[in-house]
């Protein structure tokens, strides 16, 4: 806490300007008008403070918005946003874009900090979803962002949106989380024709079902491996072999490469070897030639 | 430009363990994924073993198998190579080559990390 | 696991002369899983060939590559000063993956 002091005579700031950087923190104190420095917040970015002075600025504000600041003082916050604590932010309640981006650029090129992520979340949970220009906007400053949502926070997510969607966008995002913005994506996209579709469905397949692969192969999509080692192991399981090589075409020989890794490898094991050995390329570990195979889950659901 | 970084030498006591990085940057992360080789003074390559940093699936040679972890963050685009109860003979160079998905070369390597076992 | 066995150990040519490199297969290597690559002293391995005969990018057209089974080649046309290194050829038809013990191509 900075004491109260009196403003020393003719020091009184009548606007925030460059001559306040030579102010030390009590004369800031006693000597800036806190409702001055609300309407004038814009120039406090174009004026090198010291992160000491910042701190008394903070200070003002806090005093004079103690249930939490404006939209018309957020705004303008530029780096003093970034003294602001989780707390601070949870008071605040942010509805306009701009000021999102604006804050959101004082953030640019660093990790997503606490701080950020309150922000995020309060507009969010303000909005009611996640609409297509919000989504636009923080994936485009956190690639990462739409990944680091639970399943329950996608679900949120109108398909509309699903068009502001990147595949770098989904780079980190889990199953479960694939599992949500499948269907939506499906959605989405299903006007479109065959090629089209595939293009943009395709960062979303990790939460596709084994009848939507099974369409796919008709298609002649030649999904990539990349894809295709992507897809839940249970949706690829029942893929037959001639499935699997009109699904990915061209590609078809990248199984090699990958067929000790699921989902391939438990795929191979799946297929009679007389099948693999169809593919020519070398696929060694399906089910020796005569031997029966039983579908356990099959005689269960009978039972 | 396609590029592997490998963090710095390491000189490691027998019985210790070392953990080698490798950023990758300049291409999209979770296409390709990433093996280690080794190579010991004077001496051929040796593959010891591969991560899927898409879906954090790992391959070991049998050889290396128990003693290797391989393990990735898709966040900064690096992976990792931790290798346990080290001896003189894991003295060696040890490489992240990075390889398509679907394809068995490799077409881009780090710098290499040179790990030295020694009491 | 394939035992890749290269010959010569060591090829002592002169700049403008033709290398002949072998990689013998302790058992059959399917065509397309066969690569090879060149490393210089304190340098990292580089890709030259994949699946036997294709030319990876940057590779000039002096090299080239051949074979199948349990016998592959691979050929310098005529040698550069920057073609002097060691070349090693690498299998992923069976696991696990493994390379072969090296020809060194120096300067006679």
């Known amino acids: 806490e900075v004491e109260k002091t009196a403003c020393p005579s003719g020091k009184k700031a009548r606007e925030i300007d460059e001559s306040l950087i030579f102010y030390k923190k009590w004369e800031l104190e006693a000597c800036v008008d806190a409702a001055l420095l609300a309407t004038q917040m814009d120039r406090v970015n174009a004026i090198p403070f010291t992160y000491e002075q910042l701190d008394v600025l903070k200070h003002k504000l806090d005093e004079l918005y103690p249930q939490g600041y404006p939209e018309s003082v957020i705004q303008h916050l530029g780096y003093l946003f970034l003294k602001m604590s989780p707390e601070d932010i949870r008071k605040w309640n942010v509805t306009s874009l701009e000021t999102l981006k604006a804050l959101l650029e004082v953030n640019k090129g660093h990790e997503m900090s606490p701080q950020v992520a309150t922000l995020i979340d309060r507009f969010v949970k303000g909005r009611g979803q996640l609409d297509k220009d919000t989504l636009d906007t923080l994936t485009a400053f956190y690639p990462g962002y739409l990944c680091s949502l639970s399943p329950e926070e996608l679900s949120s997510v109108p398909p509309s949106s699903i068009w502001a969607v990147r595949p770098q966008d989904l780079d980190t995002c889990d199953p479960r989380q694939l599992d949500v913005l499948y269907p939506k994506a499906r959605l989405a996209f299903q006007n479109m024709n065959g090629s089209e579709y595939f293009v943009k469905i395709q960062s979303f397949l990790g939460g596709a079902p084994t009848e939507d692969l099974k369409a796919l192969s008709q298609q002649n999509v030649s999904m990539d491996l990349a894809t295709f080692m992507k897809l839940r192991t249970d949706a690829v399981l029942p893929l037959t072999v001639a499935e699997v090589q009109k699904l990915l075409g061209p590609h078809v020989e990248g199984l090699k490469a990958e067929e000790r890794h699921r989902p391939v490898r438990d795929w191979i094991l799946r297929q009679r070897q007389d099948d693999l050995d169809t593919l020519g390329l070398g696929l060694q570990g399906g089910i020796p030639n005569g031997y029966l195979v039983l579908d356990l889950s099959m005689q269960e659901a009978l039972s | 430009e396609v590029q592997l970084v490998q963090s710095g030498a390491e000189v490691k006591k027998p019985g210790a363990s070392v953990k080698v990085s490798c950023k990758a940057s300049?291409?999209?992360?979770?296409?390709?994924?990433m093996d280690w080789v080794r190579q010991a003074p004077g001496q051929g390559l040796e593959w010891m073993g591969d991560i899927n940093p898409s879906t954090g699936g790992t391959i070991y040679n049998q050889k290396f198998q128990g003693r290797v972890t391989m393990t990735e963050d898709k966040s900064t685009s690096t992976v990792y190579m931790e290798l346990s109860s080290l001896r003189s003979e894991d003295t060696a160079v040890y490489y992240c080559?990075?390889?398509?998905?679907?394809?068995?070369?490799?077409?881009?390597w780090g710098q290499g990390t040179t790990v030295t076992v020694s009491s | 696991e394939i035992v890749l066995t290269q010959s010569p150990a060591t090829l002592s040519l002169s700049p403008g002369e033709r290398a002949t490199l072998s990689c013998s297969a302790s058992?059959?290597?399917?065509?397309?899983?066969l690569s090879w690559y060149q490393q210089k002293p304190g340098q990292s391995p580089r890709l030259l060939i994949y699946r036997t005969s294709n030319l990876a990018s940057g590779i000039p057209a002096r090299f080239s590559g051949s074979g199948s089974g349990t016998d592959y080649t691979l050929t310098i046309s005529s040698l550069e000063p920057e073609d002097f290194a060691v070349y090693y050829c690498h299998q992923w038809s069976s696991f696990p993956y493994t390379f072969g013990g090296g020809t060194k191509v120096e300067i006679k």
């Open positions: 080559a990075r390889r398509r998905i679907g394809t068995g070369y490799f077409d881009v």
């Open positions: 300049g291409y999209t992360f979770t296409d390709y994924n």
């Open positions: 058992s059959s290597v399917i065509s397309s899983y």
